[in-house]
C-alpha cells in the first residue's frame, strides 16, 4: 500500500519557524505576519535497506509546493538545497534516493535530521535569526540542530 505524506510544522528550540524566501528556507522568529511553511514528511519505503539505529529515514517536502529538501556537494562541502520534486515520486522509487533522505531521530520532544547521503551532516539553523537552513557537522555549537515537530491535521 502507498502511504501519504504527513504534514508537520517545524520550529527550533528558540521558537523560530521555517519560511520560504526566494526559493530558500530560512528560520525566523514566529510572529503574527510570518507564514511558516508546512513540511510534508514521509518515511522511505525501503527502510530495511538503510542503516539501522540512525533514525527513521524520511523524505522532506514543502507541502503543496512540489519542492523537496536535498543534500548535494558544492565543492567539497555538502549543502542543503530545495529541488523541484514530487515527494511521492521519491517515495515510489525502486531504491532509496539518498540525496533526498534524512535520518529523523527523536529524543524527547527534540528531533534531528541527518543526511543519509552525507552521514554526520545535520540540518541546522544559525543561532542568529533570519538565516538560511544549512547542513552542519558542528552539533550544539554556533548552530541549532534540534527541532520540534508538530503534527498537523
Amino acid at each position: 500500500k502507498s502511504e501519504m505524506p504527513q504534514p508537520v510544522s517545524i520550529q527550533d528550540i528558540n521558537h523560530r519557524v521555517w519560511v520560504l524566501q526566494d526559493q530558500i528556507l530560512i528560520a525566523v522568529p514566529r510572529k503574527d505576519r510570518v507564514s511558516p511553511v508546512t513540511i510534508s514528511l514521509i518515511s522511505c519505503r525501503h527502510v530495511e535497506t538503510l542503516e539501522k539505529d540512525r533514525g527513521n529515514p524520511i523524505y522532506l517536502g514543502l507541502n503543496g509546493l512540489n519542492l523537496c529538501l536535498m543534500c548535494a556537494k558544492a565543492g567539497d562541502q555538502p549543502t542543503l538545497q530545495l529541488k523541484e520534486k514530487d515527494i511521492m515520486d521519491l517515495y515510489n522509487q525502486p531504491e532509496p534516493v539518498k540525496s533526498f533522505l534524512f535520518y529523523h531521530s527523536q529524543s524527547g520532544r527534540n528531533s534531528t535530521f541527518e543526511s543519509v547521503a552525507f552521514p554526520g551532516w545535520f540540518i541546522a539553523v544559525s543561532s542568529e535569526g533570519g538565516c538560511p537552513l544549512i547542513l552542519t557537522q558542528e552539533l550544539g555549537k554556533a548552530n541549532t540542530t534540534d527541532f520540534g515537530l508538530t503534527m498537523l491535521f
Epitope: 535497506t49 538503510l50 542503516e51 520534486k85 522509487q93 525502486p94 531504491e95 532509496p96 534516493v97 547521503a117
Partner: antibody, heavy 121, light 109 residues
Framework: EVQLQQSGAELVKPGASVRLSCTAS????????IHWVKQRPEQGLEWIGR????????RYDPKFQGKATITTDTSSDTVHLQFSSLTSEDTAVYYC??????????????WGQGTTLTVSS | QAVVTQESALTTSPGEAVTLTCRSS?????????ANWVQEKPDHLFAGLIG???DRAPGVPARFSGSLIGDKAALTITGAQTEDEAIYFC?????????FGGGTKLTVL
Amino acid sequence: EVQLQQSGAELVKPGASVRLSCTASGFNIKDTYIHWVKQRPEQGLEWIGRIDPAIGTTRYDPKFQGKATITTDTSSDTVHLQFSSLTSEDTAVYYCARLHYFGNNFFFDYWGQGTTLTVSS
Amino acid sequence: QAVVTQESALTTSPGEAVTLTCRSSSGAVTTSNYANWVQEKPDHLFAGLIGGTNDRAPGVPARFSGSLIGDKAALTITGAQTEDEAIYFCALWFSNHWVFGGGTKLTVL
C-alpha cells in the same frame, strides 16, 4: 570516465565456490547501487541482486538467495559476487551494472564487460 | 514470480521507426514498474538507454524514447540507424526485485 572493470574468466569444478569482482572507477561507488546480472547463451538476462556499497545492505532475487552473496570493499571500490555449490547451471556470463539516480529516475547506465564462468569437471 | 516477455526478433530499415515491447505475466505494466531499457552490442557491450519508463539516460540520442503502449512498456526508435542493430533488453521493477526480459534482436537492413 565511468568504468566497471570485471575480473577474468573462471573455470571451476562442480561443488566448488568462486568469487567474481567488479572494480569501479570514474565515480564514487557509494553514490550508486551495484547490481549483478546473469546471461546464459540464447537466454535472457537474470537479475541476481544488488548491494548498496555505502552501507553494505543487499537485495537478492529469491532464486539466488542463499546461492549468491554480494559484498563490497569500499577501500578499493570493488564489489564481489560469491557463488557456492556450483553446478553446470551456473555456467554463464556475469555482469555488474550501476543503477544510478539521475534527474528523476534510476538507470542501469553503465555495465562491466562481463566475466565468463564455466563450471565443468 | 513475473515473467517478462519481449519480441525475440524484429527487422527494420534505416530511417524507419520501430517499436519494441515488454510485457509482464503479472498484469499491465505501469509507471510503478520503472521500466528500464538496455542495449547490448557485440562483445558484451551494454549501455542503459531508458529509465523510469520514459526518461532517457544522459547522452542517449533523442531517437530513442520510452513509453507505455496499452498494457506494455515500449521502446521506440524513430529513424533507426545501422548502428542501432543490437539486442535490447527491458527490465521491470516488482516491489523488491527486478526482472529482465529475454531481449529483442533488432536487425537494421
